[in-house]
Interface confidence: medium
């Protein structure tokens, strides 16, 4: 679990001729706000696919009214961070979509209207817990400057927020009646101690004794602004949070990317993201071939290798479009029977069945179990016009009337002895082994090579298998 954070520093007309004077034009007063959408992975998914990692809207900005004949001012922006909580692991690679919307405040039939001013899409790699990354993007005639980061929350740590740690003061096991949760590290690792005097505001460290500076700061302790003028006019997070994230003239100023490419700053250089059909350091090369990997979502590219030869993408099931960029609506074929609800999960179709029906496509009528009895606590499971019983532990056969020996399959490894038990089986492990099925060797010092024994159990103790 964690939070993706986005800070918009500025949004306004980009450099060069033809820049718009106002976001509101002749429509009357308006106010700006931003929407961020996160999708996992680096694939170019269909635009309408959901923001699977999450989405967030900013607050509405102040009302803006165009002043005739006045120079185009900085546009008033909403305050604060945009925060997108994520529930599961941070994927590391993701697509970031930032949209700038304007809300038209004049009278509208059917309520307020929003119109999209600009949309930028970046495919990025980002580890959780790292410093702020900064970017400058152009969308049409508009320029957007922003910073972003991912950070873990609650007890999560690590670059994907998947390792859980327990505060030193917390109890070391789960409460009564509870199974151990996801594996917790016994103690939270302390963050590394940075070099003495390293700026808390502008420096950080990943190894003990080092002092690495956020962009815009320099010096052995990150206390010297990289450029004394670089933060003038910066609208964004305070230097207490991020240092100076958008210094003055940078590699992307003047946009070195041709043919509508968008520019991202990298340490000491820049990177162009090119529109489809162009590639090269500055998007200066046209004529896409299969060598450029134009087919997304696992599509197979067929075509000549020379620049004059067109290519064709053969799309895998579930995708379509000239570049396999669109997801097929497989539910339109209505695969779920008996009124089931179809869900396209991407990797598979799932049918949610109405009461009384079951099966992958809701094809089975559960009435087959009517009047059928399964003995000894078994439950009836419908199966294509017949029924079968799912038996409780210790019983088997068509109607669960036969006793089954849970030890018959020799479940205890490494010479452990199996005992039948009313709720399953118990393994008594041979010396040197532990675990519910004696599967883990014990080191000579008494520490297991794999998961530790639950509290209260010593290596070699019988352990009940639940």
């Amino acid at each position: 679990a964690g939070v993706f954070e986005l800070q918009i520093h500025s949004f306004g007309p980009g450099p060069g001729p033809g820049a718009p004077r106002s976001p509101c034009s002749a429509r009357g007063p308006c106010r700006l706000f931003f929407r961020v959408c996160l999708k996992p992975g680096l694939s170019e998914e269909a635009a309408e696919s959901p923001c699977a990692l999450g989405a967030a809207l900013s607050a509405r900005g102040p009302v803006y009214t165009e002043q005739p004949e006045a120079p185009a001012p900085d546009l008033p922006l909403p305050n604060g961070l945009l925060q997108v909580p994520f529930r599961d692991a941070w994927p590391g690679t993701f697509s970031l979509i930032i949209e700038t919307w304007r809300e038209e405040l004049g009278d509208q039939i059917g309520g307020p209207a929003w119109s999209l001013l600009a949309r930028v899409t970046r495919r990025r790699r980002l580890a959780a817990g790292g410093p702020w990354a900064r970017d400058i993007q152009r969308a049409g005639a508009w320029e957007l400057r922003f910073s972003y980061r991912a950070r873990c929350e609650l007890l999560a740590v690590g670059t994907a927020c998947t390792r859980l740690c327990r505060p030193r003061s917390a109890p070391s096991r789960c409460g009564p009646g509870l199974r151990p949760c996801a594996p917790l590290e016994d103690e939270c690792e302390a963050p590394p101690v940075c070099r003495a005097g390293c700026s808390l505001e502008h420096g950080f460290c990943e190894q003990p004794g080092e002092c690495r500076c956020l962009e815009g700061w320099t010096g052995p302790l990150c206390t010297v602004p990289a450029s004394t003028s670089s933060c003038l006019g910066l609208r964004g997070p305070s230097s207490a949070t991020t240092g100076c994230l958008v210094p003055g003239p940078g590699p992307c100023d003047g946009n070195p990317c041709a043919n509508g490419g968008s520019c991202s700053e990298t340490p000491g250089s820049f990177e162009c993201t090119c529109p489809r059909g162009f590639y090269g350091l500055r998007c200066e090369v046209s004529g896409v071939t299969c060598a450029d990997g134009p087919c997304f979502n696992g599509g197979l590219c067929v075509g000549g290798a020379d620049p004059d030869s067109a290519y064709i993408c053969h799309c895998p099931p579930g995708f379509q479009g000239s570049n396999c960029e669109k997801r097929v609506d497989r539910c339109s074929l209505q695969p779920c029977r008996n009124g089931g609800l179809c869900l396209d999960l991407g990797h598979a179709l799932r049918c949610r069945c109405r009461a009384g029906f079951a099966g992958p496509r809701c094809e089975h009528n559960l009435d087959d179990c009517a009047g059928r009895a399964c003995a000894n606590g078994g439950t009836c499971v419908e199966g294509g016009g017949a029924h079968r019983c799912s038996c409780a532990l210790g019983f088997g056969g068509r109607d669960c009337r036969e006793r089954a020996d849970p030890c018959a399959a020799r479940p205890c490894a490494h010479g452990g002895r199996c005992y039948a038990h009313f709720s399953g089986l118990v393994c008594a492990c041979a010396p040197g082994y532990m675990g519910s099925r004696c599967e883990f060797p014990v080191h000579p010092d008494g520490v297991s090579a794999l998961p530790a024994a639950p509290p209260g159990l010593r290596p070699g103790d019988p352990q009940r298998y639940l």
Epitope: E48, A52, L57, G110, W114, S115, L116
Partner: nanobody
Framework: QVHLVESGGGSVQAGGSLRLSCAAS????????MGWFRQTPGKEREGVAT????????YYADSVKGRFTISHNNAKNTIYLQMNSLKPEDTAMYYC??????????????????????WGQGTQVTVSS
């Protein structure tokens, strides 16, 4: 998927009050907006009130401004519609919806159904004179 379950509908005399609730479950972090729409037989579904569940900005149809209040409890993933000074013309099936601006469009109306991908089953509100 996002699942929405409405409650709180019923019958009331004109001038009375009702409070509708809508509980959301599932991938609620994928949606930006939740709201209430209503529909009477033979007519199109119309927006009543919507709320940006992130920062709390609200939108109301002109016909309910000053009488209805939409609110949300993010911790419970629930939105509410407090309906006061009810009129017979408020009689309708009220639907809870969740969604937001699509990532493939350039225009959106917070009080119109397009863009709301997830809908509840509806709860009936009847106001008698």
């Amino acid at each position: 998927q996002v699942h929405l379950v409405e409650s709180g509908g019923g019958s009331v005399q004109a001038g009375g009050s009702l409070r509708l609730s809508c509980a959301a479950s599932g991938y609620t972090y994928r949606v930006n907006f939740m709201g209430w729409f209503r529909q009477t037989p033979g007519k199109e579904r119309e927006g009543v009130a919507t709320i940006d569940s992130g920062v709390g900005t609200t939108y109301y149809a002109d016909s309910v401004k000053g009488r209805f209040t939409i609110s949300h409890n993010n911790a419970k993933n629930t939105i509410y519609l407090q309906m006061n000074s009810l009129k017979p013309e408020d009689t309708a099936m009220y639907y809870c919806a969740a969604g937001g601006p699509p990532t493939d469009g350039d225009r959106w109306y917070p009080l119109r159904p397009p863009g709301y991908n997830y809908w509840g089953q509806g709860t009936q509100v009847t106001v008698s004179s």
